[in-house]
């Protein structure tokens, strides 16, 4: 499974699209900025095995895909960029799922990953709640876009786990 290279390439393309999607100056949104508490500490001290890294990455990308697939999201972003971004995420999910199939011979206790998956889900719940509280305002979406860019950048740390053989 040659995931690191393909994933890095898709990740960079997704980041570029995400950067282009901005429709409002972040400098006009300073009052709306928010701390979403990305679960960095939980990931930082952990040496991820390949299958663990894949499942956590999958969860992050799946949650991002869900977030940008809503009706409210469609109204917030330029349609062609949003479609390209969603396609890039969908391809990443496919790559990860194909990799899981190849790694199927590797035994791993599912419980090992539950804490990390739960942390990711709670993080995205906080993002969704923030958008709801801010009534999906343009600035709220801009703040979320900046946050997702950061979480995407952080996923490069997870990819280190993909380079190790179990």
């Amino acid at each position: 499974c040659d995931l690191p290279q393909t994933h890095s390439l898709r990740n960079r393309r997704a980041l570029i699209l995400l950067a282009q999607m901005g429709r409002i100056s972040p400098f006009s949104c300073l009052k709306d900025r928010h701390e979403f508490r990305f679960p960095e500490e939980e990931f930082d001290g952990h040496q991820f095995q390949k299958t663990q890294a894949i499942s956590v990455l999958h969860e992050m990308i799946q949650q991002t895909f869900n977030l940008f697939s809503t009706e409210d999201s469609s109204a917030a972003w330029e349609q062609s960029l949003l479609e390209k971004f969603s396609t890039e995420l969908y391809q990443q999910l496919n790559d990860l799922e194909a990799c899981v199939i190849q790694e199927v011979g590797v035994e791993e206790t599912p419980l090992m990953n539950e804490d990390f998956i739960l942390a990711v889900r709670k993080y995205f719940q906080r993002i969704t709640l923030y958008l709801m509280e801010k009534k999906y305002s343009p600035c709220a979406w801009e703040v979320v876009r900046a946050e997702i860019m950061r979480s995407f950048s952080f996923s490069t740390n997870l990819k280190k786990g993909l380079r190790r053989k179990d």
Epitope: P26, L30, A146
Partner: antibody, heavy 123, light 112 residues
Framework: EVQLQQSGGDLVKPGGSLKLSCAAS????????MSWVRQTPDKRLDWVSI????????YYPDSVKGRFTISRDNAKNTLYLQMSSLKSEDTAMYYC????????????????WGQGTSVTVSS | DIVMTQAAFSNPVTLGTSASISCRSS???????????LYWYLQKPGQSPQLLIY???NLASGVPDRFSSSGSGIDFTLRISRVEAEDVGAYYC?????????FGSGTKLEIK
């Protein structure tokens, strides 16, 4: 290793123009916001301009608005500051700085700085 | 604009003892999101400024834990627990709460 290599500083006459450059290496330049900060002869730090990672949005304090233009070329990993209608009070050491990845909390901490380039405006 | 006020010089300190540097802002830097957008930078002689502290109390990468920072929304203190010769320089506080971002005038750390 993150590096910001600056160039373009010079002695110019009042009313003149100058373009400063800041070549970035050791990180994904297109993912980071950037700023220019100047240090006046009395050693005060004065924030001059900021640009978003994609280059679409900029902001300037009133002291330089309309005279200075910040821009970037992500393909060349380079940040620029075009200065025109220069005044004697623009005399300073100019630093480019990278903004830390703040995410939704918009933390604009300047985590890496260039070595500085000197601009002197005098007749 | 938010004005950041600092004394020009610190009280002279002996190497190995602790030092405190103060900063005051003209407006509270505590955002409704719970973050205090106060930063400390150190400029050593002949060098570019370097980030020491972000969001009032967080140590920047590579900064020794001899440095710490605290404060209310308006009054802030940078502490150095055991001053070393390499700590000499000008310490600047800054705010990123509002545009334009502003810096204090800097405090020079004086060694006895």
């Amino acid at each position: 290793e993150v590096q910001l290599q600056q160039s373009g500083g010079d002695l110019v006459k009042p009313g003149g123009s100058l373009k400063l450059s800041c070549a970035a290496s050791g990180f994904t330049f297109s993912s980071y916001g950037m700023s220019w900060v100047r240090q006046t002869p009395d050693k005060r730090l004065d924030w001059v301009s900021i640009i978003t990672s994609g280059g679409s949005y900029t902001y300037y304090p009133d002291s330089v608005k309309g005279r200075f233009t910040i821009s970037r070329d992500n393909a060349k990993n380079t940040l620029y500051l075009q200065m025109s209608s220069l005044k004697s009070e623009d005399t300073a050491m100019y630093y480019c700085a990278r903004h830390a990845e703040g995410g939704g909390n918009y933390d604009y901490a300047m985590d890496y700085w260039g070595q500085g380039t000197s601009v002197t405006v005098s007749s | 604009d938010i004005v950041m006020t600092q004394a020009a010089f610190s009280n002279p300190v002996t190497l190995g003892t602790s030092a405190s540097i103060s900063c005051r802002s003209s407006k509270s830097l505590l955002h409704s999101n719970g973050i205090t957008y106060l930063y400390w930078y150190l400029q050593k002689p002949g060098q570019s400024p370097q980030l020491l502290i972000y969001q009032m109390s967080n140590l920047a990468s590579g900064v020794p834990d001899r440095f710490s920072s605290s404060g209310s929304g308006i009054d802030f203190t940078l502490r150095i627990s055991r001053v070393e010769a390499e700590d000499v320089g000008a310490y600047y506080c800054a705010q990123n709460l509002e545009l334009p971002f502003t810096f204090g005038s800097g405090t020079k750390l004086e060694i006895k």
